[in-house]
């Protein structure tokens, strides 16, 4: 489904402003911040979501408290530049003319420089590792049940094709979800693994981006799966370029 016609909202992105001013009075939704029209039948790109987050009402920060078990948000919030398709521009700069190169999920992959810094292409993040630690339970979850439930979640909630969920590893209490998607594998209309991972991250933090849906209620054979820590690792098709001094 696209934008909901009855009350003109965007089911997949609440950081939008919608009105029935599209062709033929159809409901049309635009992302906050950028004003770009969004397709409400699929996930909105992470770039547009980050941009929307920077211009959202203060209430979006003060009234939505991350769940008590959520990781403190250290995901490097900034107001990104997005291209006409809603993807991150390869070079990002702040108001003080400090610039850096980012990958397709908007994570910095070079040292910071000035306006002369060149970022020749947007390097694709093709492998994402989502590390979760769940709260103690009576016993370990059954691995195959857990695997099936997480694959179902990514397929149904985030509309990510099952072939992009490469593996689900489990060693109580640590769960690792591997998402893989090469440039050659991603067809038109496929959800990007970076966008799916971002929606999942926000869901886990109790900050769902979906309009009119409660937060995540993850259950494995009826047993609640409550996440108390999340770490996400991004691997790019071309390794990042940081100077040695950053590594010491």
């Amino acid at each position: 489904h696209t934008a909901a016609q009855d009350n003109c909202t965007c089911p997949t992105n609440k950081m939008t402003v919608c009105s029935p001013d599209g062709p033929g009075g159809r409901c049309q939704c635009r992302a906050l911040g950028s004003g770009m029209a969004v397709d409400c039948s699929t996930l909105t790109s992470k770039c547009l979501l980050l941009k929307a987050r920077m211009s959202a009402p203060k209430n979006a920060r003060t009234l939505v408290r991350p769940s008590e078990h959520a990781l403190v948000d250290n995901d490097g919030l900034y107001d990104p530049d997005c291209d006409p398709e809603g993807r991150f521009k390869a070079r990002q700069c702040n108001q003080t003319s400090v610039c850096w190169c980012v990958n397709s999920v908007g994570v910095r992959r070079t040292d910071k420089g000035d306006l002369s810094l060149r970022c020749d292409e947007l390097v694709r993040t093709h492998h994402i590792l989502i590390d979760l630690r769940h709260r103690p339970t009576a016993g370990a979850f059954n691995h195959s049940d857990l695997d099936a439930e997480l694959r179902r979640l990514f397929r149904e909630r985030y509309r990510l094709h099952p072939k992009f969920v490469a593996a689900v590893h489990y060693e109580q209490p640590t769960i690792q979800i591997e998402l893989r998607q090469n440039t050659s594998q991603k067809a038109a209309g496929d959800v990007d693994i970076g966008d799916a991972a971002y929606y999942f991250e926000r869901d886990i933090k109790g900050e769902s981006l979906f309009q009119g849906r409660g937060g995540l209620d993850l259950r494995v054979r009826g047993e609640p799966l409550q996440v108390e820590r999340t770490l996400i690792y991004y691997l790019d098709e071309i390794p990042p370029k940081f100077s040695m001094k950053r590594l010491t």
Epitope: N59, R65, S208, F210, G212
Partner: antibody, heavy 118, light 105 residues
Framework: QVQLVQSGAEVKKPGASVKVSCKAS????????MNWVKQAPGQCLEWIGI????????TYNQKFQGKVTITVDKSTSTVYMELSSLRSEDTAVYYC???????????WGQGTTVTVSS | IQMTQSPSSLSASVGDRVTITCQAS??????LAWYQKKPGKAPKLLIH???NLQTGVPSRFSGSGSGTDFTFTISSLQPEDIATYYC????????FGCGTKLEIK
């Protein structure tokens, strides 16, 4: 169709408490915030407080802190507002209102009149 | 945040263009909504995000502005528009204007 149905009018004595309910139907209950708004006779509309039914978090207008408690029962899709230590200035119509994704109030209950009189 | 709405009341004829203003005590971006309230009824959302018409609301209603100054307009007043109109800022918690009571001359 979204509907917010509030409980009926109440007449209370000063010092008493009252609990007003607001039952939601027609959409996901935990996916939206719920608010309470006061309209005293001849006065402006005043926002009282908000609850996130998913997590049960509340935020109150400082003016009503200590006077009002907002709670939720997810099993019945109902939000409650309790007013304590009632005084004549609490006489008003109280509305529940749903907060849309960006928090403006898109649907309202029909209002509940609370009269405080000795 | 304080919201100053004016005028507090106004009288106009059917077909007239009617304008109401709301001023915020600080920048609220475009996070302003307008409501219509008739006696004994719940408020009805007309406009959100300053200028976005809610589904089903007639196009004679419109809104404009940003930052601290906002305007609500009825392009051609109809008898059924007699009501009290309120603005609401929803950027930083929530504050209503004190309303404009609209009457027919």
């Amino acid at each position: 169709q979204v509907q917010l149905v509030q409980s009926g009018a109440e007449v209370k004595k000063p010092g008493a408490s009252v609990k007003v309910s607001c039952k939601a139907s027609g959409s996901s209950f935990t996916g939206y915030t719920m608010n309470w708004v006061k309209q005293a006779p001849g006065q402006c509309l005043e926002w009282i407080g908000i609850i996130n039914p998913y997590q049960g978090d509340t935020t109150y207008n400082q003016k009503f802190q200590g006077k009002v408690t907002i709670t939720v029962d997810k099993s019945t899709s109902t939000v409650y507002m309790e007013l304590s230590s009632l005084r004549s200035e609490d006489t008003a119509v109280y509305y529940c209102a749903r907060g849309a994704g960006l928090y403006y109030f898109d649907y309202w209950g029909q209002g509940t009149t609370v009269t405080v009189s000795s | 945040i304080q919201m100053t709405q004016s005028p507090s009341s106004l009288s106009a004829s059917v077909g007239d263009r009617v304008t109401i203003t709301c001023q915020a005590s600080q920048d609220i971006n475009k996070y302003l909504a307008w409501y219509q309230k008739k006696p004994g009824k719940a408020p009805k959302l007309l406009i959100h995000y300053t200028s976005n018409l809610q589904t089903g609301v007639p196009s004679r209603f419109s809104g404009s502005g940003s930052g601290t100054d906002f305007t609500f307009t009825i392009s051609s007043l109809q008898p059924e528009d007699i009501a009290t109109y309120y603005c609401l800022q929803y950027d930083d918690l929530f504050t209503f204007g004190c309303g404009t009571k609209l009457e027919i001359k």
